[in-house]
Amino acid sequence: APTSSSTKKTQLQLEHLLLDLQMILNGINNYKNPKLTRMLTFKFYMPKKATELKHLQCLEEELKPLEEVLNLAQSKNFHLRPRDLISNINVIVLELKGSETTFMCEYADETATIVEFLNRWITFCQSIISTLT
């Protein structure tokens, strides 16, 4: 059974992931980003189901495409380079989902824009955090 300290650690990691995803979204999703329209032409694959930490496998698999789109943005709104930002997210995702479990991600038929993709994973983080508190 999860201990209170492991629950607390999971919660902190999810909060960190949530903040990173929100920072990316805020950095790109405004009219002051002249690359926004072109960024919206990139397709992202969404999880068929995202209710447990193991489903973060689906996010992990989309981190490389996310980095490529963020490289296009070259946004001054990010304190870190896209590579470092995605690397940080990747570390958190690996810790949260656990590296021992082999979970095959199932994707939904409908693809999404970067904004929809980020909002989906932000909602996921908020949902899991709410079950932990």
Partner: antibody, heavy 119, light 108 residues
């Protein structure tokens, strides 16, 4: 309603210059990046240039780089395209088009203005 | 430079289904957009993000994408659908905006 009204086309000799204008109304012009797209007679559409919402960033197709300059005056809600060193292959209908902030495409277009480069 | 390839023309009878293809290497990761352009008029967006229809566009217009191919389908084409149709996207880096060569749809 949301509208883009163009002016400034015409016939011009090779090597000469021409300036096109695009007046915006019905939306907050200063919140949108704007584009110019052209279409040669009987041909397809070709993206020409993009200017950011505040005019600080500009991008050009290779075919016009160094010859065309896009600019905007947000106080007048107007977009411009300055075309220098014009060539016969620049003959086309030129459209101004608004960059959508929610789609990855152009969502509002001007009516188009014809530019003919001929001696 | 990145290219989108469309058939130059297509002819269907009224009521038939018109299917216009657009081939592009980046489509597994890039959305396709479709513009309709009637003679002497500015283009109008009829499909965005592969499958979505802007408000005001009739339900007979639909889009799909699989692999490197995007498709615009007009189910039960009508005479007023006669126009040029252009697919649009950006290259794999998102840097260059690209239109297909256009498909002239004749409905007679």
């Amino acid at each position: 309603q949301v509208q883009l009204v163009q002016s400034g086309g015409g016939v011009v000799q090779p090597g000469r210059s021409l300036r096109l204008s695009c007046a915006a109304s019905g939306f907050t012009f200063s919140n949108y990046a704007m584009n110019w797209v052209r279409q040669a007679p009987g041909k397809g559409l070709e993206w020409v240039t993009l200017i950011s919402y505040d005019g600080s960033q500009k991008y050009y197709a290779d075919s016009v780089k160094g010859r065309f300059t896009t600019s905007r005056d947000n106080s007048k809600n107007t977009l411009y395209l300055q075309m220098n060193s014009l060539r016969a292959e620049d003959t086309a209908v030129y459209y101004c088009a608004r960059d959508s902030t929610t789609l990855g495409a152009f969502d509002v277009w001007g009516q188009g203005t014809m530019v003919t480069v001929s001696s | 430079s990145y290219e989108l390839t469309q058939p130059p023309s297509l002819s269907v009878s009224p009521g038939q289904t018109a299917t216009i293809s657009c081939s592009g290497d980046a489509f597994p990761r890039k959305f396709a957009y479709w513009y309709q352009q009637k003679s002497g008029q500015a283009p109008v967006l009829v499909i965005y993000e592969d499958t979505r229809r802007p408000s005001g566009i009739p339900e007979r217009f639909s889009g799909s994408s699989s692999g490197t191919m995007a498709t615009l389908t007009i189910s039960g084409a009508q005479v007023e659908d006669e126009a040029d149709y252009f697919c649009y996207s950006t290259d794999t880096t998102g840097t260059h905006r690209v239109f297909g060569g256009g498909t002239k749809l004749t409905v007679l």
